[in-house]
Amino acid sequence: IVNGSDCQKDAQPWQGALLLGPNKLYCGAVLISPQWLLTAAHCRKPVFRIRLGHHSMSPVYESGQQMFQGIKSIPHPGYSHPGHSNDLMLIKMNRKIRDSHSVKPVEIACDCATEGTRCMVSGWGTTSSSHNNFPKVLQCLNITVLSEERCKNSYPGQIDKTMFCAGDEEGRDSCQGDSGGPVVCNGKLQGLVSWGDFPCAQRNRPGVYTNLCEFVKWIKDTMNSN
């Protein structure tokens, strides 16, 4: 997150981290039910661990943390690497969470966000694109949903209904390491960090997010059948 600020501890209890090896964070994720996470499809890896209820970037133990294995990864069937359409994936964890003040699911928004809606994006991604600088704790950033027209003008030929753009003045954006993390608007999960230009936080190059309102049925059906 570029030019965000430290999240309040436990203010994003649905925020998850996907880890390679013992503690190498590579993507964010979002808890949407006691045993299921959402992340970006481009975050798919054959073996990974899941960390919930953690505030710090470092692997130091925190009392609220819970660790899990992913036992099933289900990318949306319409996702095709390296494209950006349908960039979401469900992850089933090896067990249910222990509900606590540090670990809680978030409800997915059924209605699509409208232009001007204020949202919060969070993650442990780099705070500077051109020279990686990872934060000590989870970062939060208020962003505004942009119009479809402005989104398409920013990225001609690259935007479809499975995406929305959000940003703020130049200098504020999600960035490398934030993929798959949550965009929460009015208390509901509206999007996932998906893509954007390099470096992050350029003028007229907003972050692009998976438009989850388009996938509510697929998410429910997939969870029910697995």
Partner: antibody
Framework: QLQLQESGPGLVKPSETLSLTCTVS??????????WAWIRQPPGKGLEWIGN???????YYNPSLKSRVTISVDTSKNQFSLKLSSVTAADTAVYYC????????????????WGQGTTVTVSS | EIVLTQSPGTLSLSPGERATLSCRAS???????LAWYQQKPGQAPRLLIY???SRATGIPDRFSGSGSGTDFTLTISRLEPEDFAVYYC????????FGGGTKVEIK
């Protein structure tokens, strides 16, 4: 299958500008998933990264070469180019163009497709 | 700039043997930002490993990468005749740099 092909003069005089072009076939340059890079390798030595160009045309250069380097893209021709000014004998090398992937995960994917390289000699 | 030092400079081994190549960074590098390449004479480099430990598409599983912080390793579990080449590590945590290379030659 994506292929990259470098082209340009094999001999450049000292103090002049080296100009190379990389033609991309089997894929499209305007992609928000890939960046395009130049790397060089002096005779008998290791690899040196020169710079990258991204979807929007934003560039990222090796600090030691930054004052002399320009990388640009011509999407209509599916090409990207390197210009290196005020060359000296130390710029004699095989020059490679390459493609790398990027997204908003915290993983560096490396450069997965390379041209075969073109030799540039700086000599009067 | 981050300087990558590879050792040994040359490794003389026989086919079937195990090769262990080292790459040491002058300052800490996130393992997510380290790659390994193979280069044969007269050819362009070929990506082997990214993110310190993930194999690139089409790379045989005899190649593996590990490490974190300042010390990284490329291991070739059983050398095949086609594996004799020069190997480079590369970091992209800050301005990208390559190591000086390790030549794996036939003993």
């Amino acid at each position: 299958q994506l292929q990259l092909q470098e082209s340009g003069p094999g001999l450049v005089k000292p103090s002049e500008t080296l100009s190379l072009t990389c033609t991309v076939s089997g894929g499209s340059i305007p992609s928000s998933s890939y960046y395009w890079a130049w790397i060089r390798q002096p005779p008998g030595k290791g690899l040196e990264w020169i710079g990258n160009i991204y979807y929007s045309g934003s560039t990222y250069y090796n600090p030691s070469l930054k004052s002399r380097v320009t990388i640009s893209v011509d999407t209509s021709k599916n090409q990207f180019s390197l210009k290196l000014s005020s060359v000296t004998a130390a710029d004699t090398a095989v020059y490679y163009c390459a493609r790398g992937e990027y997204d908003r995960s915290a993983l560096y994917y490396g450069m997965d497709v390379w041209g075969q390289g073109t030799t540039v000699t700086v000599s009067s | 700039e981050i300087v990558l030092t590879q050792s040994p400079g040359t490794l003389s081994l026989s086919p079937g043997e195990r090769a262990t190549l080292s790459c040491r960074a002058s300052q800490s590098v996130s393992s997510s930002y380290l790659a390994w390449y193979q280069q044969k004479p007269g050819q362009a480099p070929r990506l082997l490993i990214y993110g310190a430990s993930s194999r690139a598409t089409g790379i045989p599983d005899r190649f593996s990468g590990s490490g974190s912080g300042t010390d990284f390793t490329l291991t070739i579990s059983r050398l095949e005749p086609e594996d004799f080449a020069v190997y480079y590590c590369q970091q992209a945590f800050s301005s990208p740099t390559f190591g000086g290379g390790t030549k794996v030659e036939i003993k």
